[in-house]
């Protein structure tokens, strides 16, 4: 797993330790929570992070719902159960045998249930809105400058491949940024829109998950871009199943 | 080279704790993790969890959680193992061993737990 | 929790046989799993690293190979100081496990 050889750390994941008795006396670099070894060239899953970050205060909150298939995540933090991979399990449970079925993003996608609740596969999140609102400034932002800044952003800080930018929207002070990525075209070693849009929600809310690089420090054209509201609605590829009662709540 | 000596055996009684050392040379002690395995008698090997030496981060293994607490000095290259409300099936040798693949292992220390 | 299950319980063979122990995970783990040499009263002793590395002062007979869930230790001929418990476990996630051990003994 590539990491710094000098030092033996991991760029992308402070939420690790790391130390040279990976094969070949490599440097190994295992997320906190799951001991997982992670792969420091490339983002972690956020599957992995949350487990990592499982101690951390509960934050849940209530969004307004875009579409009738939109999820959004309020149900906070939880211990999710990853896979060999770090990918979510389809089926999460807590410690007290309430289960429920979430999507590629962990977010909730079924009523919770018991231990006999069936989570037959993992639905993929392909579609992600980032809605944000900036802080007042003199005048708006020129919108090309902001899209190139903001696909710059996710090209290289999070190494998400351009053509899964779908768009970026802005009617002053409201910013929007559509992440796609359909199963059939994430390829391996592609970035997971998820983990971006994950990093990316830490970034803006001042808890960078990069290893000793500054916080996110935004500018279109010299001027600062400060985010003062974001929220996240997650679309997948299969709606999810709530009941009745729940939907009309 | 690489060596890992452990503190001398212990008999204790049950609801005792223990305290097991382990001290570490011929390498640099904060870059490794240091796990600690026991063996009860007749039987196979059981990881009871670890800590890195460079910022105490330790992981312990559920089923030892509330009673394990592992700590290190490292000014004197040491971990310890201190294991509470000893009972008599936790009668075993204890073993601290390097890195993740337990490349190299100390000698062991026998914890007898009797009343 | 990884299961790891080794197998056979017991092996039976002598000096100059070829020796095939297995080792197999509950769930994928790659390359995270590590072989041990235990005789009685002693520590363990690591045999092979990361499913097929060697390490140094091991002597070249003994070999590993294998990824995901099944993996194999091989001692290509045994010597009489070979006869002892061997133990495999992986360092794929927390927490660390390790096989229930697999007893050689001379025929």
């Known amino acids: 797993h590539t990491a710094a050889q000098d030092n033996c750390t991991c760029p992308t994941n402070k939420m690790t330790v790391c130390s040279p008795d990976g094969p070949g006396g490599r440097c190994q670099c295992r997320a906190l929570g799951s001991g997982m070894a992670v792969d420091c060239s490339t983002l972690t899953s956020k599957c992995l992070l949350l487990k990592a970050r499982m101690s951390a205060p509960k934050n849940a909150r209530t969004l307004v719902r875009p579409s009738e298939h939109a999820l959004v995540d309020n149900d906070g933090l939880y211990d999710p159960d990853c896979d060999p991979e770090g990918r979510f399990k389809a089926r999460q449970c807590n410690q007290t045998s309430v289960c429920w079925c979430v999507n590629s993003v962990g977010v909730r996608r079924t009523d919770k249930g018991d231990l006999s609740l069936r989570c037959d596969e993992l639905v993929r999140t392909h579609h992600i809105l980032i809605d944000l609102r900036h802080r007042p400034t003199a005048g708006a932002f020129n919108h090309s400058d902001l899209d190139a800044e903001l696909r710059r952003l996710f090209r290289e800080r999070y190494r998400l491949h351009p053509k899964f930018v779908a768009a970026v929207h802005y009617e002053q002070p409201t910013i929007q940024i559509e992440l796609r990525q359909n199963t059939s075209q994430k390829a391996a070693g592609d970035v997971d829109i998820g983990d971006a849009a994950y990093y990316f929600e830490r970034d803006i809310k001042g808890e960078s998950l990069f290893q000793g690089r500054g916080g996110l420090d935004l500018r279109v054209r010299g001027e600062p871009l400060q985010v003062e509201r974001t929220l996240i609605y997650y679309l997948d590829e299969i709606p999810p199943k709530f009941s009745m009662k729940r939907l009309t709540a | 080279q690489v060596q890992l000596v452990q503190s001398g055996a212990e008999v204790k009684k049950p609801g005792a704790s223990v305290k097991v050392s382990c001290k570490a040379s011929?390498?640099?002690?904060?870059?490794?993790?240091i796990n600690w395995v026991r063996q009860a008698p007749g039987q196979g090997l059981e990881w009871m969890g670890n800590i890195f030496p460079s910022d105490s981060y330790s992981n312990y293994n559920k089923k030892f959680k509330d009673r394990v607490t592992m700590t290190r000095d490292t000014s004197t290259s040491t971990v310890y193992m201190e294991l509470s409300s000893l009972r008599s099936e936790d009668t075993a040798v204890y073993y601290c061993?390097?890195?993740?693949?337990?490349?190299?292992w100390g000698q062991g220390t026998l914890v007898t737990v009797s009343s | 929790e990884i299961v790891l299950t080794q197998s056979p319980a017991t092996l039976s063979l002598s000096p100059g046989e070829r020796a095939t122990l297995s080792c197999r995970a509950s769930?994928?783990?790659?390359?995270?799993i590590h072989w041990y040499q235990q005789k009685p009263g002693q520590a363990p002793r690591l045999l092979i690293y990361y499913a097929s590395e060697s390490i140094s002062g091991i002597p070249a007979r003994f070999s590993g190979s294998g990824s995901g869930t099944d993996f194999t230790l091989t001692i290509s001929s045994l010597e009489p100081e070979d006869f002892a418990v061997y133990y495999c476990?992986?360092?794929?996630?927390?927490?660390?496990?390790f096989g229930q051990g697999t007893k050689l003994e001379i025929k």
């Open positions: 011929g390498y640099t002690f904060t870059s490794y993790w």
């Open positions: 476990s992986q360092s794929f996630s927390w927490p660390f496990t």
């Open positions: 769930q994928t783990i790659g390359t995270s």
């Open positions: 061993a390097r890195g993740s693949g337990f490349d190299y």
